[in-house]
């Protein structure tokens, strides 16, 4: 199809080489008086949609994304050619940064209902650049945490070094929904709730004498509880003796509850004590069996192919540790009688 009639938007993604970050493009179809497909729930151009910035169709997944090759080849269907780019409804998600993402991206309705709909498309010219060292040293992260129940703020990474007064108007989206009241380089949250978690996009406009373009950044926000002040608890084993049958295989499970820590480096391991000797046992990897906002339960098993007489003289010790301290639980094997 002819893309010369598409509305055009220029975007800049300046990515940090120090961190993983994502990027999104919205299929922001133009405000048309032209086409029934593009009507945004009959809003006038001066009104702002309260929901997604791309109200083109009743079925929001009803758009097609293409990339325009720089060599003039025909448009390429994004889904077929670019595994690191995912389409979710009307949003294009870039999972990895890199200058190779630069280019022209076109979206339009899949269903063309009238000849006028041909022009109902948007072409986004995306320029991707690595952040220079000259950029702000303490720019906000693309992953930000908000402490539940307290005051917090979400900063736009590309503007976090600007003072409030210098900052241009910022357009914010949360999970694709326009936050029309938020216009600052940071969203100040008076009291953090779990619903503040999500994917935030901040846009601002930069201009020179020739043209203007949108600078965009994506921030993944998670809501967290305060770091635990407690050592981990061992939930299992509870008893310090375990009845076993000689010659049979045995699995002893160690389950421990670790309180939330922003920097989480849990340790859970088994070691064996035999008179004055003790050594760590090579056992299967630990696995998380339950994770909540406040804590995580991690399990690690020790597996004996067959219980021997020697094992009855040993103590099997589960050792767990977080940044606060460690806890141990030992188990003595006892032969089942009868």
């Amino acid at each position: 199809f002819n893309i010369s009639g598409c509305s055009t938007k220029k975007l800049l993604w300046t990515y940090s080489t120090r961190s993983e970050e994502e990027f999104v493009l919205f299929c922001d179809l133009p405000e048309p008086q032209k086409s029934h497909f593009c009507h945004r729930n009959r809003l006038s151009p001066k009104q702002v949609p309260e929901h997604l910035p791309f109200m083109g169709s009743n079925d929001l997944s009803d758009v097609q994304w293409y990339q325009q090759p720089s060599n003039g080849d025909p448009l390429e269907d994004i889904r077929k050619s670019y595994p690191h780019i995912i389409q979710d409804k009307c949003t294009l998600h870039f999972l990895t940064p890199g200058v190779n993402n630069s280019g022209s991206y076109i979206c339009r309705p899949k269903m063309i209902k009238s000849p006028y709909d041909v022009a109902c498309c948007v072409k986004m010219i995306l320029e991707v650049k690595p952040q220079t060292n000259a950029s702000c040293e303490y720019s906000a992260s693309h992953k930000q945490d908000l402490l539940l129940g307290s005051t917090g703020s979400i900063s736009c990474p590309s503007l976090s070094c600007q003072s409030d007064a210098q900052s241009p108007a910022v357009t914010w989206y949360k999970n694709g929904k326009l936050l029309s009241v938020e216009r600052s380089n940071r969203i100040v949250v008076d009291e953090v709730y779990d619903y503040h978690q999500g994917t935030y996009v901040c846009d601002y406009t930069q201009s020179d004498t020739v043209s203007s373009w949108t600078v965009r950044a994506v921030v993944q926000v998670r809501t967290i509880v305060g770091d635990t002040k407690l050592k981990p608890d061992i939930l299992d084993p509870v008893e310090d003796t375990l009845e076993v049958e000689l010659g049979k295989p045995l699995t002893i499970s160690c389950k421990a509850r670790f309180g939330f820590e922003r920097v989480f480096n849990p340790v859970i391991k088994w070691y064996i004590k035999d008179s004055d000797l003790e050594w760590e046992v090579s056992v299967p990897e630990a696995k998380s069996i339950k994770s909540t906002l406040k804590d995580e339960i991690i399990e690690r098993n020790i597996i004996l192919e067959k219980v021997t007489q020697r094992d009855l003289r040993r103590k099997f010790v589960c050792f767990v540790q977080n940044s606060i301290g460690n806890t141990t639980q030992s188990v003595q094997l006892k032969e089942k009688r009868g």
Epitope: Q47, V181, E182, R183, T205
Partner: antibody
Framework: EVQLEESGGRLVQPGTSLRLSCAVS????????MSWVRQAPGKGLEYVGI???????YYANWAKGRFTISKDTSKTTLYLQMNSLRAEDTATYFC???????????WGQGTLVTVSS | DIVMTQSPSSLSASVGDRVTITCQSS????????LSWFQQKPGQAPKLLIY???TLASGVPSRFSGSGSGTDFTLTISSLQPEDFATYYC???????????FGQGTKVVIK
């Protein structure tokens, strides 16, 4: 240096229209939101409305229908079109560069509009 | 309808006094914190003092402070200076941007 300068205020008859201008320098209207606020003589401040950098406008409930905010980004000028003027519209009108929906960071010095027969 | 009530409407004070002005909003301001305070002197444009209820604007002396959340807010001048005699306004931002508005003002005059 960021500067805002209002103009266009004068004495007009009730029922007529008037367009106020606010010339901006030191920044781009493409990048900042702008508001109009008015103040009747000896009275308090009253919010008129806001235009986002994108061009979207919002108005105080009392201003809807009679007042229109617009801008000419190439001329770096903000406008307030006022129709069907009444005596109670007599006020000093300020333009302000807005940060978030509030606050109003940088203000012009204001232009006086008098509506009287 | 949105109502912003400032009190008192005027107050007399002396240099060095601690001055407190309150602002009540009905309903709550957006996000419980979208409240600003301004100072205006005769013949001048207003000047921003405090935003986000408690954040001091750039260049504003530290004797000015703001507090409060939701519906009840306070501007405090810890030690009144001669240049502080002026009218003070609170301004609230709301989830419906059309509802943004100002309190009626508090005039601080020399006793």
């Amino acid at each position: 240096e960021v500067q805002l300068e209002e103009s266009g205020g004068r004495l007009v008859q009730p029922g007529t229209s008037l367009r106020l201008s606010c010339a901006v320098s030191g920044f781009s209207l493409n990048s900042y939101d702008m508001s109009w606020v008015r103040q009747a003589p000896g009275k308090g401040l009253e919010y008129v409305g806001i235009i986002y950098n994108s061009g979207t406008t919002y108005y105080a409930n009392w201003a809807k229908g009679r007042f229109t905010i617009s801008k000419d980004t190439s001329k770096t000028t903000l406008y307030l079109q006022m129709n069907s003027l009444r005596a109670e519209d007599t006020a000093t009108y300020f333009c302000a560069r807005t940060h978030n929906t509030l606050p109003f960071y940088i203000w012009g010095q204001g232009t006086l509009v008098t509506v009287s027969s | 309808d949105i109502v912003m009530t400032q009190s008192p409407s005027s107050l007399s004070a002396s240099v060095g006094d601690r001055v407190t002005i309150t602002c009540q909003s009905s309903p709550s301001v957006y996000n419980n914190n979208r409240l600003s305070w301004f100072q205006q002197k005769p013949g001048q444009a207003p000047k921003l003092l405090i935003y986000y209820a408690s954040t001091l604007a750039s260049g504003v002396p530290s004797r000015f402070s703001g507090s409060g959340s939701g519906t009840d807010f306070t501007l405090t001048i810890s030690s009144l200076q001669p240049e502080d005699f002026a009218t003070y306004y609170c301004a609230g931002g709301y989830s419906s941007i059309s509802d943004n508005g100002f309190g009626q003002g508090t005039k601080v005059v020399i006793k």
